[in-house]
């Protein structure tokens, strides 16, 4: 079953390569277990950036070699992606799945364009 | 008389606060004198960033204490804006006027959203 997911259109990573955005979903019921996946779309290729499962009210448990951290509050997930470089600029899409209890719902946001600028190296301190 | 002006939708300033973009106009005739103005639109307020007049084939002459530099090639103007900070993020609109010979033509682009990220300060070298 489909579900509406909202996320900001544009976000800038800071000079340390960290970008944060909120992914909000319109929950049709009282979900107790949720999975959030961030997908990156660039040059028509889609890559999973990070994924987390959480029980409502609990902290997010990220899967695999995650570069993300996050917190949840109600139907909002605050996501932070770290270690970004200019080559990581792209469209970051938030996918939300309501896993439990049934029925299963899934929604995909329109994507957040994250812009990343590589910092200038600092001069050597002799 | 109206004239079509094209410019990129989005540009990122580099970590030194420099952003470059091309402003291209569809010249209806053989203009010899052209004026290019860059306007910044933010929070519904429009300010003039820089302006230059040039004779076709010659270099751009910017007015007074300009933060812009540029070159022209045919119906294209390559503009560079310097000294940008995060607070300068906004929509930069290219306005082109064909001043001579008559008739006078004017065109305004849709704007280039320039994103600026302030760099992290380098650690003090003790």
């Amino acid at each position: 079953k489909a579900m509406h997911v909202a996320q900001p259109a544009v976000v800038l990573a800071n000079s340390r390569g960290i970008a944060s955005f909120v992914c909000e979903y319109a929950s049709p019921g009282k979900a107790t277990e949720v999975r959030v996946t961030v997908l990156r779309q660039a040059d028509s290729q889609v890559t999973e950036v990070c994924a987390a499962t959480y029980m409502m009210g609990n902290e997010l448990t990220f899967l695999d070699d995650s570069i993300c951290t996050g917190t949840s509050s109600g139907n909002q997930v605050n996501l932070t992606i770290q270690g970004l470089r200019a080559m990581d600029t792209g469209l970051y899409i938030c996918k939300v799945e309501l896993m439990y209890p049934p029925p299963y719902y899934m929604g995909i946001g329109n994507g957040t364009q994250i812009y990343v600028i590589d910092p200038e190296p600092c001069p050597d301190s002799d | 008389k109206a004239m079509h002006v094209a410019q990129p939708a989005v540009v990122l300033a580099n970590s030194r606060g420099i952003a470059s973009f091309v402003c291209e106009y569809a010249s209806p005739g053989k203009a010899t004198e052209v004026r290019v103005t860059v306007l910044r639109q933010a929070d519904s307020q429009v300010t003039e960033v820089c302006a230059a007049t040039y004779m076709m084939g010659n270099e751009l002459t910017f007015l007074d204490d300009s933060i812009c530099t540029g070159t022209s090639s045919g119906n294209q103007v390559n503009l560079t804006i310097q000294g940008l900070r995060a607070m300068d993020t906004g929509l930069y609109i290219c306005k082109v006027e064909l001043m001579y010979p008559p008739p006078y033509y004017m065109g305004i682009g849709n704007g280039t959203q320039i994103y600026v990220i302030d760099p992290e300060p380098c650690p003090d070298s003790d």
Partner: antibody, heavy 119, light 107 residues
């Protein structure tokens, strides 16, 4: 092409430690983490944990917590897995693996390192 | 932790046979299920990811299906090189877990 090359077989005494290396090539090392799996003789596969190459963050299987440490050396593109206080139950082939476009899915594996623990 | 149960643990089949292996998760994992083939002395080889997507370079006689808790790996026409052990693995949540394996032997 992506390649993961592991260190050679090890024989260890009970109570000792072992350190297995996994040298990665064919991609930007810091763009992907490394996961470690093991397989006891004649048994199935067991996930041990993973390490994020760019910042060294790691996550270990509960049963190995306190005994395992995963590290990376970004200058050489090498991941390491150290297991301490070895027992005969730790006799296994140890594999490093890298994900592809999907999280927790492993198209790329090292050739495996046999660690034999003798009492 | 999510438990993955594979059945059968072993089976005997002939070249050309259609072979089906099932995998059941202890809770719903949507389509986050992957299949690997392993031959003696070798590392596992990814066959199917996200329940039904065929990994590049894998013959089309391999297919996967299912979602939620029940999944199936099918080999439409068994070839001599397919005699191996097959593992399912969930990539829904940490810790990642594997099924116990299904050994496909020659009849």
């Amino acid at each position: 092409q992506v390649q993961l090359v592991q260190s050679g077989a090890e024989v260890k005494m009970s109570g000792a430690s072992v350190r297995v290396s996994c040298k990665a090539s064919g991609y930007t090392f810091t763009s992907y983490g490394i996961s470690w799996m093991r397989q006891a003789p004649g048994q199935g596969l067991e996930w041990m944990g993973w390490i994020t190459a760019y910042n060294g963050n790691s996550n270990y299987a509960q049963k190995l917590q306190g005994r395992v440490t995963m590290t990376t050396d970004t200058s050489t593109g090498t991941a390491y897995m150290e297991l301490r206080s070895l027992t005969s139950d730790d006799t296994a082939v140890y594999y490093c693996a890298r994900r592809g476009d999907y999280l927790g899915v492993f198209p790329y594996w090292g050739q495996g390192t046999l660690v034999t623990v003798s009492s | 932790d999510i438990q993955m149960t594979q059945s059968p643990s072993s089976l005997s089949a002939s070249v050309g046979d259609r072979v089906t292996i099932t995998c059941r998760a202890s809770q719903s994992i949507s389509s986050y299920l992957n299949w690997y083939q392993q031959k003696p002395g070798k590392a596992p080889n990814l066959l199917i990811y996200t329940a039904s997507s065929l990994q590049s370079g894998v013959p089309s006689r391999f297919s996967g299906s299912g979602s939620g808790t029940d999944f199936t790996l099918t080999i439409s026409s068994l070839q001599p090189e397919d005699f191996a052990t097959y593992y399912c693995q969930q990539s829904y949540s940490s810790p990642l877990t594997f099924g116990g394996g299904t050994k496909v032997e020659i009849k």
